[in-house]
């Protein structure tokens, strides 16, 4: 039996439709928007989650605009094209035939062009820096306690192997979580750092993607850790290609 089997729901992705129509009457869940079958015993890919989010009725969406502080992913939400494995296609285009290349977390890494734009490969984001600022507390958190709690969170809540949490830095009130995962390190079945970071980002915003699981309650030795600002920086294995015009703007 699987976790989804008991009442045919997807515990790891609430943006799904599930029914017992899999082999042998097993529960099978499909992502909204794409209709692709998802494995409910792991995280759903960010591409399928974004597609599901964009397919949801407009009035059912909350907090859909990206944070004003999202410096890197400043194109915000879009309806992505996903490949048969649920990964972002290297080239994304909108309805007006404007196209651009993205990395493995779906963030634009080139200037926008037209339909003639070529994106030869999906470039992997191998290093993610999650920069958090916590609300004022009576005193600073103990660094080693904070480190242990954040590592536990990524290991247990997001199924990310501990070896991919490279470091946790802390200088009150700033916390930085470094995730690193090269192409050679990620094997079939392993959670991608981009997917773990996206689930974490949604959790921090109070928009948990988990079904029937409480929202994120981060505590360090019983003291609540409340995040008031989040920035996420993405570093790709191959540097992005933006024109000088954009860089000097």
């Amino acid at each position: 039996h699987t976790a989804a089997q008991d009442n045919c729901t997807c515990p790891t992705n609430k943006m799904t439709v599930c029914s017992p129509d899999g082999p042998g009457g097993r529960c099978q869940c499909r992502a909204l928007g794409s209709g692709m079958a998802v494995d409910c015993s792991t995280l759903t890919s960010k591409c399928l989650l974004l597609k599901a989010r964009m397919s949801a009725p407009k009035n059912a969406r909350t907090l859909v605009r990206p944070s004003e502080h999202a410096l890197v992913d400043n194109d915000g939400l879009y309806d992505p094209d996903c490949d048969p494995e649920g990964r972002f296609k290297a080239r994304q285009c909108n309805q007006t035939s404007v196209c651009w290349c993205v990395n493995s977390v779906g963030v634009r890494r080139t200037d926008k062009g037209d339909l003639s734009l070529r994106c030869d490969e999906l470039v992997r984001t191998h290093h993610i820096l999650i920069d958090l600022r916590h609300r004022p507390t009576a005193g600073a958190f103990n660094h080693s306690d904070l480190d242990a709690e954040l590592r536990r969170l990524f290991r247990e809540r997001y199924r990310l192997h501990p070896k991919f949490v490279a470091a946790v830095h802390y200088e009150q009130p700033t916390i930085q979580i470094e995730l690193r995962q090269n192409t050679s390190q990620k094997a079939a079945g392993d959670v991608d750092i981009g997917d773990a970071a996206y689930y974490f980002e949604r959790d921090i915003k109070g928009e948990s993607l988990f079904q029937g699981r409480g929202g994120l309650d981060l505590r360090v030795r019983g003291e609540p850790l409340q995040v008031e600002r989040t920035l996420i920086y993405y570093l790709d294995e191959i540097p992005p290609k933006f024109s000088m015009k954009r860089l000097t703007a």
Epitope: T42, R159, P162, A188
Partner: nanobody
Framework: QVQLQESGGGSVQAGGSLRLSCVVS????????MAWFRQAPGKEREGVAG???????TYKPSVEGRFTISRDSAKRTLYLQMNSLKPEDTAMYYC?????????????????WGQGTQVTVSS
């Protein structure tokens, strides 16, 4: 079809030991993580110990130092050596597997489960 079969459960006095085994069949890959879970009557299923494909381990704090999880990839068998058993360890013990390499004790990540083996510890 992946199947798991546990054995080794039984009744023991507090302070005693037991060794549980779980034989895995049907996997076409060796890249799966494994764990032991337990469920006492009227309680939720809880993770006891987990082991990844690199043989790194994780434990529920209350069993750390008393229980040891190990796996023999050649025999496709998972073990749980339980020492210094306490009455509160009484439960049905389940073996579970999940595809990929991870170290977690949340049942949501495991998609194949055994039928369980009963462990009873009396004072």
């Amino acid at each position: 079809q992946v199947q798991l079969q546990e054995s080794g459960g039984g009744s023991v006095q507090a302070g005693g030991s037991l060794r549980l085994s779980c034989v895995v069949s049907g996997y076409t890959t060796t890249r799966y993580s494994m764990a032991w879970f337990r469920q006492a009557p009227g309680k939720e299923r809880e993770g006891v110990a987990g082991i990844d494909t690199d043989v790194l381990t994780t434990y529920k704090p209350s069993v750390e130092g008393r229980f040891t999880i190990s796996r023999d990839s050649a025999k496709r068998t998972l073990y749980l050596q339980m020492n210094s058993l306490k009455p509160e360890d009484t439960a049905m013990y389940y073996c579970a597997t999940g595809t990929g390499n991870f170290l977690a004790l949340d049942p949501v990540w495991y998609n194949t489960w055994g039928q369980g083996t009963q462990v009873t510890v009396s004072s």
